[in-house]
Each structure stands twice: as structure tokens, then as C-alpha cells.
């Protein structure tokens, strides 16, 4: 079909449509008309756009041109940043994609000039007069959903007539935007007008299912039902789906409805919208959002364990003070010449059966958030060091006033009994930031790295993840905790909660993927209180950044509900944020402020052997090491592992300003 | 090269018609638009029609309106101008005229490729 | 119709001198201009098009600039092959284009 008929044409995709308009406009009235249909000049900022304008425009003839929404003010030449100074109609600059027909060459820019594409060829970009009626202009226009081209059916008198809210016709949609209306005309007479729009369960699709015109009934293939046919009264026929799916759009095929993953922990189909999320033994569903899941926690329990509690994602775990030891019932503690132990109360172990251990436990491991509590009317006792296990540097509190930690002995337990061995990670804080986040990106199965099952004592501080604190991106920045890590922290406890699973590989069900499981909330500072820092060990330092996502804290946080600790003196060296790379970068981690990745223990591309960190035990030589992505160069090198989860509106490659930098528009521009 | 080769002069009754060729070489005719302009004696230039031999579109000027046609041979690369019923003003001569699609990266609509022109007399 | 008005429509310099040419526009025509040079029984030659750009070939003593309403077209010093008409054309409302009356260069 030539483009240039007298007719329109577009090109639509899931979330927005390109339209082809043949008429001779200056640059202003081309806006004008795409905004009066409700969208605006095309503004094809990535490869894939531009695709899929070429595809639109086609083999145009040479000499046609057609505005697209690129206009720069006079004077405002900026040769060296890919759009030379031009803004977009949309008010901003940033782009992933040019096409410029030549080299910026120097100039003064004297005049405002607009941006037109040419029809032929390449499809190239070239700058000219605003007031210069060219041949066409290209409109985009955005929308919340669109609807697959309907199926043609055996009945039909012809193909389907599509009708956009944006008054293109045509019959050759494959996607059409919400509020488009098709019109199928049947062979028997009748036709039927259906419309796109918004389904309860959420999402659009057809206002009706099909089949749409009488035809032989549900022979010869099933009525083109994937399921079942179902011939009506009046010859209609009709599709229904088996007990655990649901009718598509297409009002054909069926679909599961928890195949999207739509529930953070389990689906169950069935239910009002198709389907119901279900929570492991251990969490609850989030009040704010059904589909997601907090963990409860069992320590704010009164008498849930006789002295010391530590609550973790799915599960807790009773502790006694030196001197004492855990009871059978995991609950109780007794005086004992033995030093202390631990009884494990994950809540998923005693439920499971073998075929169900890999489903359901230790993702929460990953993004451990737990915290200490201490049952009321425990002293804290003088710690206990293992030879092997000397505390290189520990936090400082005034006087005589200081509260000791007790770092007891492992004891090891058989693995059935006691599937975890506790493990901290070296940041204590002794006030959690609050967290008002009520929405952490989940990701599919797929993206989740596994986690390495070992048994093992605890590990020497050479061999430790570094913790990097969570920021939480719908905190207004003056709020958010700072953020710091070290390279080398400091030596832990013996006694901690595990990052490592000792029982149950991780292989998570299509219907689960929690990456970033909520974490219950104590303390109302926003301030992450570190160990001090020995002169030697340079920090690592994380980009903050306004779309980055929520890193799951993987400390435990020690909380008395006996005596608030008091906070560590100023002698330890402040947190430090950062926006853009640190000057030395030895042991930093650079990351694009919009793809910084959680700080989770993941599987990451092998890279220089020194400064890694790792928890495991250097006794399991066969075992995986997580490594931290070290930014040694300008460029990030963390793209080939970021989560499907990372924000659309990351910065491009070619580094224009970011979307929200948006510039305010007014008719005297145009 | 690109070279716009007009036919030669013309004189005619007034009444009469007259068509005038255009022959372009050098380049590809479907992919650029040919302009004819008037020039009479002392006059300043005058803007008549266009041709997008592409697509055979066409746009006249109004004043010409009527009497007019402009049409191409694509394969013979060859514009034609014909103007019917001819008085006395249509002395002059007539520019067929290339109009440039881009230079250097700019759009723009200027005749970057003249004809050497034809002059027309209209006497009785 | 959108009219060019230009001054002066004649102009008499001398070799070496500095010339410019104004070109007025009923109304707003953006940069849509372009200027031609045209020499007796010749057909005119492209100089400068959108406003201010240097057509391929033409010597750099040949300068365009203004947007809106007013242009000028600058010839640096003069060479004797420069004595000619000059014409500014818009083309904003384009394919309507129209043509300034002329401005002849002669020699002093």
C-alpha cells in the first residue's frame, strides 16, 4: 500500500500507534493536529521505534518529508549531545536513537529549526525551516492497553474494520488501542460491532468474545474453540475453558491465569479475578496489596521464646544468653555449663513433605531482613571469642554504659533438626530505618540467582558479602538512609542468622518469584549506624538514584526491647552517598543510578579475582562464589544481569538527561 | 551532471496552446519535484505549478488555474508544461525548475537546478 | 499571498565594495528563503537557501541571514562577475512560492 495515498495509515503496537498523515502542514500545524487527536508528534527515541516508523513510512518517494517532534530554538546548538539541541515536543532530550542525514557541522543556529524525516531511503533526519509546509507528519500516540486484531472466522464476510479512537480506518491492525472499535460483517447478514476495552480482572481486550458469526457450529475444528465449544440457542457458539483457565481476548484461546505471575508467593487459580494469592506459613498478605506478601513477625509475640528472638523472612528462631541452652521445645532455656544454642522455628519446615521443600523455602534467605529482640529481663553477657574469630574493630558506646554482645560458640546441630546456621553479615544497626515502601518489584523465577546450600561454620571476615543498606525509592531523598559498604566488614558474631541454605536448593515454582520479600519495621532514625572503619579499608560506595530499586537489607538488626543502645560516637566515619562516581575507584561500586541492581546474593559474570567477597566457606571448593561487580571503567558493566524488574526509564546509552528533567512547554516554542 | 534540457522558443497565436518539454538527466526524475516559472519581459519570477513525477501530483497556482497542465513521461524523464488559450501576457519565458529535497543535512525547498528556459511569443 | 518587497531595486558598487541586499516579507516566513543570482538571458542560480546557508559551490563572500519578516543577502567585495539581478524567493507556504521584484547590481 503506498503511504502516500490520500488515506492515513499507522502502525500500532502494545502501548502506542505511529499514524502516517499525507498533508502538506508547517511544523506548528502538524503538532496542533496530532495533539487535537490526542497525541503528538512522533518522537522515535529508540532503535525499536524507529523500526517500527520505518516500517510505517515504507519505500516512500525521495522527495516527501515528514515532521517529526523535534524542534530546537535559535541560538540553542549543542553539536556534541546527540540531538545537537534539539528538544522533543514532548519537552525533553533524551533519546537512545538518531538518524541524522549528516555530521553536525559548526554554525551559530541562528534560526529555530524543526526536525523532518525523509520518506525514502533510510528514513533520515534533517533540519529546516519550521514554517515550511512539508509533505506529511507522523503522530504518536500512547494508550493504556491494546487489543489483538481479531481472529478471522469461517462466517466472515470480509476482514474485521477497525476503527481508532484517533479516526484511523483500517483493516490492517494487528494491535488496536483501547477504545478502538471493530466491525465484522458475517456472511449470514447479521454483523457485530465490538469495542476494546478495559476487562474487570484488568488489562483490555474485546468487548465481546467471539465467534462472532454463524457458521457450521463447533464442527469441523472445535468452533476454533482451544477448549470447549459450546453451540448456543440461536446457532451461536461459544468458547469456555477448562476448571483453572480463562476465556483470552481473543475469545478463542485459554490462558492460566497465574502463568503472568501476578502473586508474589503462590496463585491459585480461580476466584473473582481468575485467580488468588495465597502466602508460605510465616508471611501474611500485605494490607496495601493482596498479591504481595509481609513476613509476620513471630518476635513481637509476647513469650514466643523464653529469652533472645530473632525474627527472619518465614520463620524465627529462639537464642539463650551464655550460660543457658534451648530447650527440646525451642522455646525454653536452662541453666547449662554448655555454651549457648539455637533452635530453628522456620515455620515452612515442619509443613513440608519432600515434594514440596524446593517450592517453598529459602528464597527468603536471599534478602534476609530479620531482627534481633531480646525478651525482657535478659542482661546481656560478656562476649566469648573463639581464638579464631578475633574482632577486628567493634563499635564503640561511652563509658561504662556499654552493652556487651554475646557471641557464643556454634553449636552444630544435626541438619535435620537444625536446617540453618546462623550467619550475620558484619553491619549491626542498632535503629532499622523506617520504611515506607509499599511496593518492591518482584521478578520472574527466571532472573532469581540461585542460592548455594551448604553447611558450614561461620566466616571469617575475608569471606563475607559486603552489606549494602537498602534505599527505598519512594522515600523523598531527604529521608532516605544513607548508604555505605565495606569492602572487608567486620568480624561477626558467631551466633547469626543465615544467608545460607543447608537443606533446600533454590528452584522456585513459575508462580512464585518474591526477590525483595517486606521486612518488618522497628525504629523511627533513617540512619544506618556501621562499625568503624580501619584506616586501610577503602568503603564501597552505591549511586543513589530516584528509580533504583529497593535493596533487600541483608543484616539482621539487633533490637532489645529491654534498653535502646545508645548510638555509636562520631568517631566512626560517616555514611556516604553518592550521585555520581566516586573520585578513587578501588573499591567502589559504580552503578547507572537508574539499573542499580538489589544487593542480593546473585550469581554474577566472573570477574577479576581480587577484592571478591563471598559467603561461603573455603571449605566447599566446589561451590559458586556471588561476586560484586567492581567498576573499574567509565562504562557500567552491570547491563547483561540487571532484572527484568529494572525501570523503562533508564538513561540511555547515548547519556541524554533523564526523563523527569522535562522541560515546560508553551505554544510561543512551537 | 544534472542537466534540465528545455525544448526550444515558441510562437503562437493568442487562442492557441502551447506544451513545452523538459528533459532531466543526471538523476533519478521520480525523486524530485519539477517547477515551472514564468519570467515576462521586466517582470519579476512567477511561480506556476509543480509536478511530483512520483506520483503524478500536481499543484497550480491559482492565477493560472484552468489553464495549465503539467505532466511527466517517467520514462523518458521528461516533464511537460501546456498552457491553453494564450493571449499577449503569456509572452515570456518559461524556467522548468528542480526543487532540492535536502543540502548538507537541511530540507529545503528552493530550485537548486534551472532549465535554460524557453521563450514563448504570443502575436498575432 | 505572502509579498517580498526588495530594496533597493537598484544599486550601483564598485569592485572590492561590501553589498547588501534586503528582502521584506508581507509575514512571517520563518527561514523559507532563498536567494538566486541572474545573469542576462540565463536562468537563475541557486545562492543561498534557508535563509542563511551557502549553497554547494557558491563563494563564501556570499552571506544570507534574518528569520521572520527581514533578510539580507551580503556580498563581502565585490567581483566583477558578481554584477547581476538578485532575487529573494520564500517558500514557507509552500508550493506557493513567490519572488521579490529584483535588485540589479550594476557597476559604479
Known amino acids: 500500500q503506498d503511504p502516500w495515498a490520500a488515506e492515513p495509515r499507522s502502525a500500532c503496537g502494545p502501548s502506542s500507534c505511529y499514524a502516517l498523515f499525507p498533508r502538506r502542514r508547517t511544523f506548528l500545524e502538524a503538532w496542533r493536529a496530532c495533539r487535537e487527536l490526542g497525541g503528538d508528534l512522533a518522537t522515535p527515541r529508540t532503535p525499536e521505534e524507529a523500526q517500527r516508523v520505518d516500517n510505517l513510512v515504507g519505500a516512500g518517494p525521495a522527495s516527501r518529508l515528514l515532521w517529526i517532534g523535534l524542534q530546537r530554538q535559535a541560538r540553542q546548538c549543542q553539536l556534541q549531545r546527540p540531538l545537537r539541541g534539539f528538544t522533543w515536543t514532548t519537552g525533553d532530550q533524551d533519546t537512545a536513537f538518531t538518524n541524522w542525514a549528516q555530521p553536525a557541522t559548526g554554525g551559530p543556529c541562528p534560526a529555530q529549526r524543526c526536525v523532518a524525516l525523509e520518506a525514502s531511503g533510510e528514513h533520515r533526519w534533517l533540519e529546516g525551516s519550521c514554517t515550511l509546509a512539508v509533505d506529511g507528519y507522523l503522530c504518536q500516540f500512547g494508550f493504556e492497553g491494546a487489543c489483538p486484531a481479531l481472529q478471522d472466522e469461517a462466517g466472515q464476510a470480509g476482514p474485521a474494520v477497525y476503527t481508532t479512537p484517533f479516526h484511523l480506518v483500517s483493516t490492517e491492525f494487528e494491535w488496536l488501542p483501547f477504545g478502538s472499535v471493530a466491525a465484522v460483517q458475517c456472511q449470514a447478514g447479521r454483523g457485530a460491532s465490538l469495542l476494546c476495552v478495559k476487562q474487570p480482572e484488568g488489562g483490555v481486550g474485546w468487548s465481546r468474545a467471539g465467534p462472532l458469526c454463524l457458521g457450521a457450529g463447533c464442527s469441523p475444528d472445535n468452533g476454533g474453540c482451544e477448549h470447549e465449544c459450546v453451540e448456543e440457542v440461536d446457532g451461536h457458539v461459544s468458547c469456555r475453558c477448562t476448571e483453572g483457565f480463562r476465556l483470552a481476548a481473543d475469545g478463542r484461546s485459554c490462558e492460566d491465569p497465574c502463568a503472568q505471575a501476578p502473586c508474589e508467593q503462590q496463585c491459585e487459580p480461580g476466584g473473582p479475578q481468575g485467580y488468588s494469592c495465597h502466602c508460605r506459613l510465616g508471611f501474611r498478605p500485605a494490607e496495601d496489596d493482596p498479591h504481595r506478601c509481609v513476613d509476620t513477625d513471630e518476635c513481637q509475640i509476647a513469650g514466643v521464646c523464653q529469652q533472645m528472638c530473632v525474627n527472619y523472612v518465614g520463620g524465627f528462631e529462639c537464642y539463650c544468653s551464655e550460660g543457658h541452652e534451648l530447650e527440646a521445645d525451642g522455646i525454653s532455656c536452662s541453666p547449662a555449663g554448655a555454651m549457648g544454642a539455637r533452635a530453628s522455628q522456620d515455620l515452612g519446615d515442619e509443613l513440608l513433605d519432600d515434594g514440596e521443600d524446593e517450592e517453598d523455602e529459602d528464597e527468603a534467605w536471599e534478602a534476609f531482613g530479620g531482627g534481633w529482640t531480646e525478651m525482657p529481663g535478659i542482661l546481656w553477657m560478656e562476649p566469648t571469642q573463639p581464638p579464631d574469630f578475633a574482632l577486628a574493630y567493634r563499635p564503640s558506646f561511652p563509658e561504662d554504659r556499654e552493652p556487651q554482645i554475646p557471641y557464643p560458640e556454634p553449636t552444630w546441630p544435626p541438619p535435620l533438626s537444625a536446617p540453618r546456621v546462623p550467619y550475620h553479615s558484619s553491619v549491626l544497626s542498632v535503629t532499622r530505618p523506617v520504611v515506607v515502601s509499599a511496593t518492591r518489584p518482584t521478578l520472574p523465577s527466571a532472573h532469581q540467582p540461585p542460592v548455594i546450600p551448604a553447611t558450614h561454620p561461620a566466616l571469617s571476615r575475608d569471606h563475607q558479602i559486603p552489606v549494602i543498606a537498602a534505599n527505598y525509592p519512594d522515600l523523598p531523598s531527604a529521608y532516605q538512609p544513607g548508604i555505605l559498604s565495606v569492602s572487608h566488614p567486620a568480624q561477626p558474631p558467631a551466633h547469626q542468622p543465615p544467608m545460607i541454605s543447608t537443606r533446600y536448593p533454590e528452584l522456585f515454582p513459575a508462580h512464585q518469584s518474591p526477590m525483595f520479600p517486606d521486612t518488618q519495621v522497628a525504629g523511627t532514625q533513617t540512619t544506618t549506624h556501621l562499625p568503624a572503619i580501619p584506616p586501610n579499608r577503602a568503603p564501597l560506595v552505591t549511586t543513589l538514584g530516584a528509580h533504583q530499586p529497593p535493596q533487600a537489607p541483608d543484616a539482621p538488626v539487633l533490637r532489645t526491647q529491654a534498653t535502646q543502645l545508645p548510638i555509636i560516637p562520631t568517631a566512626q566515619p560517616s555514611l556516604t552517598t553518592s550521585s555520581r562516581s566516586p573520585v578513587s575507584p578501588a573499591h567502589q561500586v559504580s552503578v547507572p543510578a537508574a539499573t542499580q541492581p538489589p544487593a542480593l546474593p546473585t550469581l554474577l559474570p566472573s570477574q577479576s579475582p581480587t577484592n571478591q567477597t563471598s559467603p561461603i566457606s573455603p571449605t566447599h571448593p566446589h561451590s559458586k562464589v556471588p561476586q560484586i561487580p567492581r567498576e573499574d571503567g567509565p562504562s557500567p558493566k552491570l547491563a547483561l544481569w540487571l532484572p527484568s524488574a529494572a525501570p523503562t526509564a533508564a538513561p540511555t546509552a547515548l547519556g541524554e538527561a533523564s526523563l523527569a528533567e522535562h522541560i515546560q512547554r508553551d505554544d510561543r516554542w512551537l | 551532471q544534472v542537466q534540465l534540457v528545455q525544448s526550444g522558443p515558441e510562437v503562437k497565436k493568442p487562442g492557441a496552446s502551447v506544451k513545452l518539454s523538459c528533459k532531466a538527466s543526471?538523476?533519478?526524475?521520480?525523486?524530485?519535484?519539477i517547477h515551472w516559472v514564468k519570467q515576462a519581459p521586466g517582470q519579476r519570477l512567477e511561480w506556476m505549478g509543480y509536478?511530483?513525477?512520483?506520483?503524478?501530483?500536481?499543484t497550480y497556482n491559482q492565477k493560472f488555474k484552468g489553464r495549465v497542465t503539467i505532466t511527466v513521461d517517467t520514462s523518458a524523464s521528461t516533464a511537460y508544461m501546456e498552457l491553453n488559450s494564450l493571449r499577449s501576457e503569456d509572452t515570456a519565458v518559461y524556467y522548468c525548475?528542480?526543487?532540492?529535497?535536502?543540502?548538507?543535512?537541511?530540507?529545503?525547498?528552493?530550485?537548486?537546478?534551472w532549465g535554460q528556459g524557453t521563450l514563448v511569443t504570443v502575436s498575432s | 499571498d505572502i509579498q517580498l518587497t526588495q530594496s533597493p531595486s537598484f544599486l550601483s558598487a564598485s569592485v572590492g565594495d561590501r553589498v547588501t541586499i534586503t528582502c521584506r516579507a508581507s509575514?512571517?516566513?520563518?527561514?523559507?528563503v532563498a536567494w538566486y543570482q541572474q545573469k542576462p538571458g540565463k536562468a537563475p542560480k541557486l545562492l543561498i537557501y534557508?535563509?542563511?546557508n551557502r549553497y554547494t559551490g557558491v563563494p563564501s563572500r556570499f552571506s544570507g541571514s534574518g528569520s521572520g519578516t527581514e533578510f539580507t543577502l551580503t556580498i563581502s567585495s565585490l567581483q566583477p562577475e558578481d554584477f547581476a539581478t538578485y532575487y529573494c524567493?520564500?517558500?514557507?507556504?509552500?508550493?506557493?512560492?513567490?519572488f521579490g521584484q529584483g535588485t540589479k547590481l550594476e557597476i559604479k
Open positions: 525548475a528542480r526543487r532540492g529535497n535536502s543540502y548538507d543535512g537541511y530540507f529545503d525547498y528552493s530550485m537548486d537546478y
Open positions: 543526471g538523476y533519478t526524475f521520480t525523486d524530485y519535484v
Open positions: 509536478i511530483n513525477p512520483y506520483d503524478d501530483d500536481t
Open positions: 509575514q512571517n516566513v520563518g527561514t523559507a
Open positions: 534557508s535563509a542563511s
Open positions: 524567493q520564500q517558500y514557507t507556504n509552500y508550493p506557493m512560492y513567490t
